[in-house]
């Protein structure tokens, strides 16, 4: 029996009661907040092989082990995740083990164990052989292993039962609990699971099977399960479904989840049902259930009951997410916010079509209107009084509409008007009129020369570089001295650099009236020398990375009230020389046999270049003598200490914090403070603990059903 | 996979309150779909009654409104009928059934109930 | 309510024969999203109903391609193009798109 679309039990224990006929689980399985410690001995659920989302557990009172409740769990699809996790187990208080003796596959995702106070047997299991990758595993804050002395079954009788394999370069046997041994199949199966027997599957199965070489035999299915056979892809007519079986369109058509309630039904796209259409298609039609490709973005119609939307705030813009169409009218009315500029761009970037007026005032946060970024079109189908479709009115600093060298914008009807907005240029508004086709439409009160552009540099001479010097983290660049019509009008120059991966910026990207900017910006006065030309160094830059960078002349902005000429560059592009790279990441090795390693690894965080090789080194080690002291295999031997509490917040303190043995003769020496790599990162592992553990939280709890 | 089975009183006395149980396996009534009562009195058509939607929210059929409850237990994964002061017109099989976006998909094997002193 | 009217209201039908059942509703059932939700369900004796077709002529997959739906506004017909013995029960008309939901008083097939 397939059960979904998604089980979450909490609180009682008796909901676990739910799960007594599901084989498969299309969704994920949650279970937690159960404070009363109860006996989940009566609880078995030998039926549950499969699930094809996640498995989280958190906060279950007096559960040991999962084995028990799951003896036959088999796969973990991970077809979604959890934060990036297929497997979480958090903050279970009494697990001792995970005993999943029979979990063979975590197909997508990693796992999140953590702070699980007396969960042992983690290093006993070589995740390695269910995961594809174990980089990303978080195995935190629980018992440590020194206390738990795991160990596998026969290892006292000195009789192993289990396999070994090499983990972080320790060979040792592999298994889940003290009497369950980790499944391995034999290396003649390659990739493909094995019987109990140690038979092979069928390559079409996974994890497990009950026959050898039998597609409708199979625990799990490696790619869709139709009709009780595990199939490659999907038969025709029939469709993938949740990543893992084959439905027909009658069943696609009838879906209604409550994630998807408000949309329009599922659609059959690309062989698979699915909630939505891709990105860059749409419905063929609003009650279709294909997708076409989209021309350019797919149109999003948003239409506002009362005719006029007024986006005062970062809140109001958010409504407008994805929108490209907007039935209605646009007031802008933007005093004040933070990060105002590309918050707006975010929720409002990808508008492409106003049908009614388009107003913008008071809105003194504004130094640009390029937040609108794909506005191309202004039907003016509803006008102000005075037959106005683009209103700009007392906007204090305003100085930019848009880059009128990579946009077209039609006003369709109606007129503009543009007041008191000081640092708005006349000649910017003329340029609008030009592009947006209004030119002739305008009365001569409708655009205020005296008013708009009073307080601005308007008429700019071009500054030009002379010469550029880079290294691997500075640039030297220095211009032309700018002289003009008066010296003493020349304060000093302003010089704008940001990372440009892409040489598409604009001197008003992310750019707001009240602090926010994308720009990094340094002051540059006059040389006292006039014959030397200014310049500046720009250091503590990122090797290999292209910057932008322009600069712009300080001038007194007005003269007995008239305008007075400024001057700026054009935005120049520059790249920093190539560095040393960083060291490779996650690297591991494991010996495959007696006279052969193989290392993996992943490649820098940050090449700082293009990479062309790697150097592998590696020298013959000692045996460690250590390591021959104590008899691992007795039980009595391992020295216990305390309890272990589960955090992972605060440092446990050795018997002497002082000092640590260094080894030879060297005798003990003072521990090695942290360097400032190791400080950064354990702020930011502590960080992202954080913003885990937030997530969690904000998942689960939810109100209490009515 | 999904199963529905409804279970009551097989006979409720007149004026009484008439309650079924459909308890359903293999989809959890939260999850998504509208979860329906229809009954059909012998030898008779098929009635729609209403529905409790995966969000709780009912809707009824209008000349049984004042009469009729649909409730769910979601941890038990069930939903309920009640039909108040029930006469001999409310004899019927009773079915539960879950709804989609266009079809009724999954039905219960109906329970008969008998209104009779 | 929307009213469902099926005729006939009895069938008697000969194997290998059409059959044909007619459904009209009192309004139109065309919903507010463009779709017409109707539906006809087979009730076999003993049996819980079974779906046939969806959205007026959508066979259910499983479904006999003899069992076909037509019609659109107020009007809609099941046709059967060859009746076999196993078809014999009680049809039903059925429209989803207008609450309340409503039944036709269905039409029973039965063999000659």
């Known amino acids: 029996e397939i059960c979904g679309p998604g089980i979450d039990i909490r609180n009682d224990y008796q909901q676990l009661k739910r799960l007594e006929n599901c084989t498969v689980i299309e969704g994920y399985l949650h279970i937690l907040l159960i404070s009363k410690a109860e006996d989940y001995r009566s609880y078995r659920f030998p039926k549950l092989t499969v699930i094809t989302e996640y498995l989280l557990l958190f906060r279950v009172a007096g559960l040991e082990s999962l084995g028990d409740l799951f003896p036959n769990l088999t796969v973990i699809r991970g077809w979604k995740l959890f934060y990036n996790y297929a497997l979480v187990i958090f903050e279970m208080t009494n697990l001792k083990d995970i005993g999943l003796y029979n979990l063979r596959n975590i197909t997508r995702g990693a796992i999140r164990i953590e702070k699980n106070a007396d969960l042992c047997y983690l290093s006993t299991v070589d995740w390695s052989l269910i995961l594809d990758a174990v980089s990303n595993n978080y195995i935190v804050g629980n018992k440590p292993p020194k206390e738990c002395g795991d160990l596998c079954p026969g290892t006292m009788e000195e009789k192993p039962m289990c396999e070994k394999t090499t983990i972080n370069n320790e060979y040792n046997y592999r298994c889940w609990t003290t009497n369950r041994c980790q499944k391995m199949c034999p290396s003649t199966c390659g990739k493909r699971a094995c019987t109990e027997n140690n038979e092979c599957c069928h390559p079409e199965c996974l994890g497990s099977c009950s026959a050898p070489d039998n597609d409708t035999a199979c625990v799990a299915c490696r790619h869709y399960y139709y009709a009780g056979v595990c199939v490659p892809a999907c038969p025709p007519n029939t469709y993938r479904f949740e990543g893992w079986r084959c439905v027909d369109r009658d069943f696609c058509a009838n879906i209604l989840s409550a994630e998807s309630s408000d949309s329009e039904g599922f659609v059959i796209h690309d062989g698979e049902c699915m909630q939505e259409c891709p990105s860059g298609f749409i419905r063929n039609g609003s009650q279709s259930m294909y997708c076409i490709p989209c021309e350019g973005p797919c149109p999003k119609v948003c239409e506002e009951e009362k005719k006029t939307k007024t986006i005062d705030s970062v809140t109001s813009a958010q409504m407008l997410q994805g929108c490209t169409i907007f039935k209605g009218n646009l007031l802008i009315n933007i005093r004040r916010g933070n990060n105002i500029a590309s918050e707006l761009e975010n929720f409002m970037g990808l508008i492409e079509v106003v049908t009614g007026y388009v107003k913008i005032r008071h809105s003194h946060a504004l130094v640009s209107l390029s937040f609108l970024k794909n506005l191309r079109l202004i039907l003016g189908e509803e006008q102000l009084e005075g037959n106005y479709s683009f209103y700009v009115l007392d906007n204090q600093n305003l100085q930019q509409l848009w880059d009128w060298d990579h946009r077209n914008l039609t006003i369709k009807a109606g007129k503009m008007y543009f007041a008191f907005n000081p640092k708005l240029c006349v000649s910017e508004i003329y340029r609008m009129e030009e592009v947006t086709g209004t030119k002739g439409r305008q009365s001569k009160g409708d655009i205020n020369t005296r008013n708009n552009g009073e307080r601005a540099s308007c008429e700019s001479d071009v500054l030009h570089f002379t010469s550029t010097t880079t290294s691997k983290n500075r640039i030297i660049i220095t211009w032309h001295r700018y002289r003009p019509p008066d010296y003493r009008d020349l304060i000093s120059f302003t010089v704008y650099y940001k990372e440009a991966p892409f040489k598409n910026v604009t001197e008003y990207d992310g750019q707001d009236a009240c602090g926010s900017n994308s720009w990094n910006m340094v002051d540059v006065d006059l040389p006292p020398n006039k014959d030397v030309e200014p310049g500046i160094l720009l250091h503590g830059l990122k090797p290999w990375t292209q910057y932008a960078v322009y600069v712009k002349a300080v001038t007194l902005t007005m003269v007995e009230n008239d305008h007075i000429r400024g001057a700026k560059s054009e935005i120049l592009y520059i790249r920093t020389n190539a560095s040393v790279p960083s060291i490779p990441l996650d690297v591991l090795s494991a010996s495959n046999s007696s006279s052969q390693l193989i290392v993996k690894w992943n490649p820098p965080s940050l090449p700082n270049g293009n990479l062309s090789y790697y150097i592998v080194r590696w020298q013959r080690q000692p045996q460690d003598g250590y390591l021959y002291r104590h008899n691992y295999c007795s039980k009595d031997k391992i020295p216990i200490r305390k309890y272990a509490d589960g955090t992972i917040d605060i440092e446990e303190v050795t018997e002497n914090p002082k000092t640590e043995v260094c080894g030879g003769e060297k005798g003990p020496c003072c521990a090695c403070p942290k360097t400032e790599a190791e400080k950064q990162a354990e702020k930011e592992e502590a960080e992202y603990r954080k913003v885990f553990e937030n997530f969690l939280h904000n998942s689960i709890f939810v109100p209490r059903p009515e | 996979q999904v199963q529905l089975q409804e279970s009551g009183p097989g006979l409720v006395k007149p004026s009484e309150t008439l309650s079924l149980t459909c308890t359903v396996s293999g989809y959890s009534i939260t999850g998504g779909y509208l979860w329906n009562w229809i009954r059909q009195p012998p030898g008779k058509g098929l009635e729609w009654i209403g529905y409790?939607?995966?969000?709780?929210?009912?809707n009824y059929k209008p000349s049984l409104k004042d009469r009729v409850t649909i409730s769910r237990d979601t941890s038990k994964n069930q939903f309920s009928l009640k039909l108040s002061s029930v006469t001999a017109a409310d004899t019927a099989v009773y079915y539960c059934a879950r709804y989609g976006r266009v079809f009724f998909d999954y039905w219960g094997q109906g329970t008969l109930v008998t209104v009779s002193s | 309510d929307i009213v469902m009217t099926q005729s006939p209201l009895s069938l008697p039908v000969t194997p290998g024969e059409p059959a044909s059942i007619s459904c009209r509703s009192s309004q139109s059932i065309v919903h507010s999203n463009g779709n017409t939700h109707l539906q006809w369900y087979l009730q076999k004796p003993g049996q819980s109903p079974q779906l046939l077709i969806y959205?007026?002529?959508n066979r259910l997959y499983g479904v006999p391609d003899r069992f076909s739906g037509s019609g659109s506004g107020t009007d809609f017909t099941l046709k059967i193009s060859r009746v076999e013995a196993e078809d014999v029960g009680v049809y039903y008309c059925?429209?989803?798109?207008?609450?309340?939901?409503?039944f036709g008083q269905g039409t029973k097939v039965e063999i000659k």
């Open positions: 959205k007026v002529s």
């Open positions: 409790i939607s995966y969000d709780g929210t009912n």
């Open positions: 059925f429209q989803g798109s207008h609450v309340p939901w409503t």
